[in-house]
Interface confidence: medium
C-alpha cells in the first residue's frame, strides 16, 4: 500500500497538504508493540485506557487494570510485576533529559484490588523497576538506590553517597545517558533477581555548563549540569553488584575493571547478565578504538566477582572507532559462555560473529557487501536479526532467521516478500523463547503491525493497520518519493528525492536539501512520513532531497570511517557533489537552492552555506554545533580524538563554523536555537552570531526561550511557520 500511488478519479476532490496538517499531526500513524509478559501473552493499553491481557493461544483477553484505577491516580504508564500480583502506576511525569524523567509511583495490589498502603514510595522517583521474577522493587531516589523485597515492605538502602550533580547511583549522568548507554537507568537485575548490578558515576571533577532558565520569575534560574566537553575531565564510573536476598550481608561488591582498560581514562559501555552467577561487562578506552568485553563469575567462597583475563575479549578498530554508533552488545547462547555479536569483518562490513573462546577464532555467521544491523533473539535453534541485504538497498530493513541448530546454517528472510510494495523497513518484538513475535513495518507505505507464529512465521493477525490514516489520505495529493544512488569517484551516494505531485521533468523546481549527515546516521530510509518536507513538496512545489554521504552508516567501514578525525569535511563535500548532480538532471532551478538541518545537520548546513561554492541561495541551521570543542566528550572524541596539540587540536580549530564567517556574506542564513538546550548548548549559536557580527555579515536569527534541543510544544509550530516563510521568501514563492 503506497499512499503516493492512491489515485482518485475525481481529481478536483484532491487537495495538497497544508502546513496546518503537519503541525496538527493530522496524518500521524500508530504502531503496536505488544508488552510481552510470557511466551504467549501480552498486555496492551486499549483505546479507552484499560490495561488488557491477551492470550494468543486461547484467543481470550481480559482487563487486568481498569481505566478507572488508572485515572484515580492520573497514571500515564504502568508496569506489571512478573508474579502478576502487583502493578506500579506512574504519574506526575516530569521530563529531565532525553530519556530521564521523574515520576510518582503507586503500587496497586491486584489480589485485593487496592493500593498498597504503608511504606509508600517516596516522590519523585528517578527510576523504578520490578525484579525479573516475583515482585521485588528496585528504585532510585535522590541519586541513591533502594530495594524492597515486597511492595509493602520497608526499603533497604543500598547506596548512601548519592548527591545531586555529584554522585549518581543506578542512573546515568548527562553524558552517559545521552552518549553511552543510552538509557535513563544504570541498574540491571540478574535473570532470576538474585543479584542487582548498578553503576556509580562520580561527576565531582567534571566542569559544569550553566545556562539561564527564564521561567516567569523576577530572576531567572540557573541550570547547572556536569557536562564534559571534548578534552575535559570525564565521569569516573564503577560497577557494583549486591545480593538482593541478603543485601546487608556483604554489601555491594565492585566488579574489577580489566587492567588494559584501567591503565588510562575509560568508559563503561554496557552490562549484560548471562546467568544469575555470570555477568558480562563492556568497557571502552577514552580513545574509543579499543573495547573490552569481560565475562565475570560469582565466587561463592568470597562472595565476590572474578573476571579472569581468559574471559576478556578485545575488539579494536584500526581504521576508525570501535563499533558503529555504539559498540554492539553480545547476545549469549544457551551454553552461557559463547555469544553472538555484530562487528566489522575483514572486508569492513558489520556482520554477526559467533564467539566461543577468543575473538580471533570467531566464526562469521553473515557476510556480504551489506550490514547486519541488530540481533533480536537467539533461541536453541534460531537466530533472528535485521539487515539491509535485500535487493541491495541500504535504507531498508528486513528480518531474517538463521537456523543455528543445523549445519550448515540455513537463512530465511521472514519479511522480504510479505507486503513488498508497502513494507521494506521492519523491526520486531519477540515473546519469551520467540514463541511469537510482532512485526512493525514503518514503510514506505502506510505502517502496519502484525502478529506471527515464532515457529512457522505464519501471520496470526493484524495488530494495527492505520485504516483511519489510509482513509484520510485518500483525497490528499502526496508527493512522489524515489530512492536512488549516484556513483561519484568510487563513492556511492544514496539519495531520497521528494517530488511535487504533478512533477514534470521538463520544468524547473526549487531544491531544498535536508541534511543530518552525522557519523553512523542514515537519512535515506524506506519509511513512511507525512511531515514538513512532504508539505513543501505537495503545496509549495519544492523538490526536497536527502543524501547519505561519507560518514553515514550501514554501507561498510570505508564510507563510515572516512570522516574519522575529520568531521565537517567530507559530509559537506558530498552534499555539494550531490547538488551538482541534481542540477545536471535538468529539473532544478539552480538559482533557487537551499539547505537546512538540525543539530549535526545544522553544522553541515552551515558549513555548506559557507563553502564558497555559490550553489546555495539560502539555508537554515537549527541548534547547530559550531565548534567540536563545545560538544560532549564521549560523542566528539569518538570521531575526532582529543583537542590537544599532540592529537587533533588543529582540525578542531579548522572545522568551526566561526572560522568561515566571511563566507556567509553571499547567502541568506537563518540561525535558530533554544536557550535551554542541554545538549548542543546555546553557546554554539551565540558564537556563530558573534563571529558574523564581527565580520559585519548580515543574517537572520531566532531564539526560543527556555526551549531545549527538541524545540517542542508551541515552539514547534512557530519554528516551522518561521522556516516556511523564510524559504518561500528565498524561493520567491507567494504567500
Amino acid at each position: 500500500l503506497r499512499p503516493s500511488r492512491v489515485h482518485n478519479s475525481e481529481e478536483n476532490t484532491m487537495r495538497a497538504l497544508t502546513l496546518k496538517d503537519i503541525l496538527n499531526g493530522t496524518f500521524s500513524y500508530k504502531t503496536f508493540f505488544p508488552n510481552w509478559i510470557s511466551g504467549q501473552e501480552y498486555l496492551h493499553q486499549s483505546a479507552d485506557n484499560n490495561i488488557v491481557l491477551y492470550n494468543i493461544e486461547t484467543g481470550q483477553s481480559y482487563t487486568i487494570l481498569s481505566n478507572r484505577t488508572m485515572k484515580s491516580v492520573n497514571a500515564s504508564n504502568y508496569g506489571l510485576s512478573p508474579d502478576r500480583q502487583f502493578v506500579y502506576l506512574e504519574s506526575d511525569y516530569s521530563k529531565l533529559w532525553r530519556y530521564s524523567y521523574t515520576a510518582t509511583y503507586y503500587i496497586y495490589d491486584l489480589s485485593n484490588g487496592e493500593f498498597v498502603r504503608g511504606n509508600e514510595l517516596p516522590r519523585p522517583i528517578q527510576y523504578l523497576c520490578w525484579s525479573p521474577v516475583g515482585s521485588k522493587l528496585a528504585y532510585v531516589y535522590q541519586n541513591n538506590i533502594y530495594l524492597k523485597q515486597r511492595p509493602g515492605d520497608p526499603p533497604f538502602q543500598i547506596t548512601f553517597n548519592g548527591r545531586e550533580n555529584k554522585i549518581f547511583n543506578g542512573i546515568p549522568d548527562w553524558v552517559y545517558e545521552e552518549e553511552m548507554l543510552p538509557t535513563k537507568y544504570a541498574l540491571w537485575w540478574s535473570p532470576n533477581g538474585k543479584f542487582l548490578a548498578y553503576a556509580e558515576f562520580n561527576d565531582k571533577d567534571i566542569p559544569v555548563i550553566a545556562y539561564s532558565y527564564y521561567g516567569d520569575e523576577q530572576y531567572p534560574r540557573t541550570i547547572n549540569i556536569p557536562y564534559p566537553k571534548a578534552g575535559a575531565k570525564n565521569p569516573v564510573v564503577r560497577i557494583f553488584i549486591i545480593d538482593t536476598t541478603y543485601p546487608a550481608y556483604v554489601g555491594p561488591q565492585e566488579v574489577p575493571v580489566p587492567a588494559m582498560i584501567a591503565s588510562s581514562d575509560y568508559y563503561f559501555s554496557w552490562l549484560t547478565w548471562v546467568t544469575d552467577e555470570r555477568v558480562c561487562l563492556q568497557w571502552l578506552k577514552r580513545v574509543q578504538n579499543v573495547s573490552v568485553l569481560s565475562i565475570c563469575d560469582f565466587r561463592e567462597d568470597w562472595q565476590t566477582w572474578d573476571c579472569p583475563k581468559t574471559q576478556e575479549h578485545i575488539e579494536e578498530s584500526r581504521t576508525g572507532w570501535a563499533g558503529g554508533f555504539f559498540v554492539s552488545r553480545p547476545v549469549f547462547s544457551y551454553d552461557a559462555i559463547s555469544y553472538y555479536k555484530i562487528f566489522s569483518d575483514k572486508d569492513g562490513y558489520k556482520h554477526i560473529h559467533y564467539i566461543k573462546d577468543t575473538v580471533e577464532n570467531a566464526i562469521q555467521i553473515t557476510s556480504g557487501k551489506w550490514e547486519a544491523i541488530n540481533i533480536f533473539r537467539v533461541t536453541q535453534d534460531s537466530l533472528f536479526y535485521s539487515s539491509n541485504e535485500f535487493e541491495e538497498y541500504p535504507g531498508r530493513r528486513n528480518i531474517y532467521r538463521i537456523s543455528i541448530g543445523s549445519y550448515p546454517p540455513s537463512k530465511k528472510c521472514v519479511t522480504c516478500h510479505l507486503r513488498k510494495e508497502r513494507c521494506q523497513y521492519y523491526t520486531a518484538s519477540f515473546s519469551d523463547y520467540a514463541k511469537y513475535y510482532a512485526l512493525v513495518c514503518y514503510g514506505p507505505g502506510i505502517p502496519i503491525s502484525t502478529l506471527h507464529d515464532g515457529r512457522t512465521d505464519q501471520e496470526i493477525k493484524i495488530l494495527e493497520e492505520n485504516k483511519e490514516l489510509e482513509n484520510a489520505l485518500k483525497n490528499i495529493q502526496l508527493p512522489k518519493e524515489e530512492i536512488k544512488k549516484l556513483e561519484v569517484d568510487e563513492i556511492t551516494l544514496w539519495y531520497k528525492m521528494i517530488l511535487p505531485p504533478q512533477f514534470d521533468r521538463s520544468k524547473k523546481y526549487p531544491l531544498l536539501i535536508q541534511v543530518y549527515g552525522g557519523p553512523c546516521s542514515q537519512s535515506v530510509r524506506s519509511v513512511f512520513a507525512v511531515n514538513w518536507i512532504s508539505y513543501l513538496a505537495s503545496k509549495e512545489g519544492m523538490v526536497i532531497a536527502l543524501v547519505d554521504g561519507r560518514g553515514t552508516a550501514f554501507q561498510g567501514d570505508k564510507l563510515l570511517y572516512a570522516v574519522y578525525r575529520k568531521l565537517g569535511v567530507y559530509e559537506v563535500e558530498d552534499q555539494i557533489t550531490a547538488v551538482r548532480k541534481f542540477i545536471e538532471m535538468g529539473f532544478i532551478d539552480e538559482k533557487r537552492i537551499a539547505i537546512w538541518g538540525w543539530s549535526y545537520g545544522g553544522y553541515v548546513s552551515s558549513l555548506a552555506l559557507a563553502s564558497g561554492t555559490g550553489l546555495f541561495k539560502c539555508g537554515i541551521a537549527v541548534a547547530p554545533v559550531s565548534s567540536w570543542e563545545y560538544y560532549a566528550s564521549v560523542y566528539t572524541e569518538r570521531f575526532m580524538g582529543l583537542p590537544t596539540k599532540d592529537d587533533n587540536l588543529e582540525h578542531y580549530k579548522n572545522s568551526t563554523v566561526m572560522a568561515r564567517a566571511e563566507y556567509f556574506r553571499n547567502v541568506d542564513y537563518l540561525l535558530i536555537h533554544g536557550t535551554a538546550d542541554d545538549n548542543v548548548h546555546f553557546q554554539n549559536s551565540a558564537q556563530i552570531a558573534k563571529a558574523l557580527v564581527n565580520a559585519q555579515v548580515d543574517f537572520q536569527a531566532m531564539w526560543y526561550s527556555d526551549q531545549n534541543h527538541g524545540l517542542s510544544g508551541l515552539s514547534t509550530n512557530h519554528l516551522y511557520t518561521h522556516m516556511t516563510h523564510f524559504l518561500k521568501q528565498c524561493f520567491s514563492l507567494s504567500d
Partner: antibody, heavy 120, light 109 residues
Framework: EVQLLESGGGLVQPGGSLRLSCAAS????????MSWVRQAPGKGLEWVSA????????YYADSVKGRFTISRDNSKNTLYLQMNSLRAEDTAVYYC?????????????WGRGTLVTVSS | EIVLTQSPGTLSLSPGERATLSCRAS???????LAWYQQKPGQAPRLLIY???SRATGIPDRFSGSGSGTDFTLTISRLEPEDFAVYYC??????????FGQGTKVDIK
Amino acid sequence: EVQLLESGGGLVQPGGSLRLSCAASGFTFSSYAMSWVRQAPGKGLEWVSAISGSGGSTYYADSVKGRFTISRDNSKNTLYLQMNSLRAEDTAVYYCAKTHSTSWYYFDYWGRGTLVTVSS
Amino acid sequence: EIVLTQSPGTLSLSPGERATLSCRASQSVSSSYLAWYQQKPGQAPRLLIYGASSRATGIPDRFSGSGSGTDFTLTISRLEPEDFAVYYCQQYGSSPRYTFGQGTKVDIK
C-alpha cells in the same frame, strides 16, 4: 591524596588487649574493603584480617581467629582492630591497607604502621 | 591453603643489571590475582604490579611482571640505586584471602 594513619600500638602483657585505629582520608572510605597486615621484626608480611566496604563481611587469618575483631565506622572514616588474648607471637608492626575496590583485591595504599609489642 | 615460595632468598646485583625474581605457587593462581610489592627498610610496602603484569600508577616501566598458573616473575630491566629493597609477591584469589611470599631481598653487590 590517600592517607592512612594507624594508632593505638604499644607495649602490652600476654593475655592483654589493645585496640588499633586507622584514620583514612583522601578517598570515599565506605566504597573500599580494608585490611590489616602485620610484619614481625625481621620477618615477612602476614595478612591478619579484612572487612568489606559496608562492614557487613569480615575475614580473619587462622592465627588470629576468635581473638581479633575487625570493624569500621564509615561515618568517621576509621578502621579498627580489637586485639584480645594477645600472645608474644603477635608482636609486629601492624599496617592498615586499602584494597583497590569494595571487593577483595590487591592493596594499593598502606599506612606507615604502628608497633605492637607483647611482652611480660 | 596456597603457599607462595619466592626465590632466590637474596639477589646480589650491581646497578644497571637485570633482576629476575621468581614466585611459585603451591597450586594454580588466577593471573588476575597476583601482585608484587616493594618494601624498603622502615617503610610500608608499595604496590608495584597487580594482575600479574599490570604496572601500578607511577611505577617506572623498568618494572614488569609476567607468568600464569603457578609460576610468576618480576623483572627489573636495569637496576637503579633506589630499587634495592625487599620484594614480596602476594596472591589475593582464594582462601585464606591473602597470602604473601616470604620475600626476596635485592641488595647491592
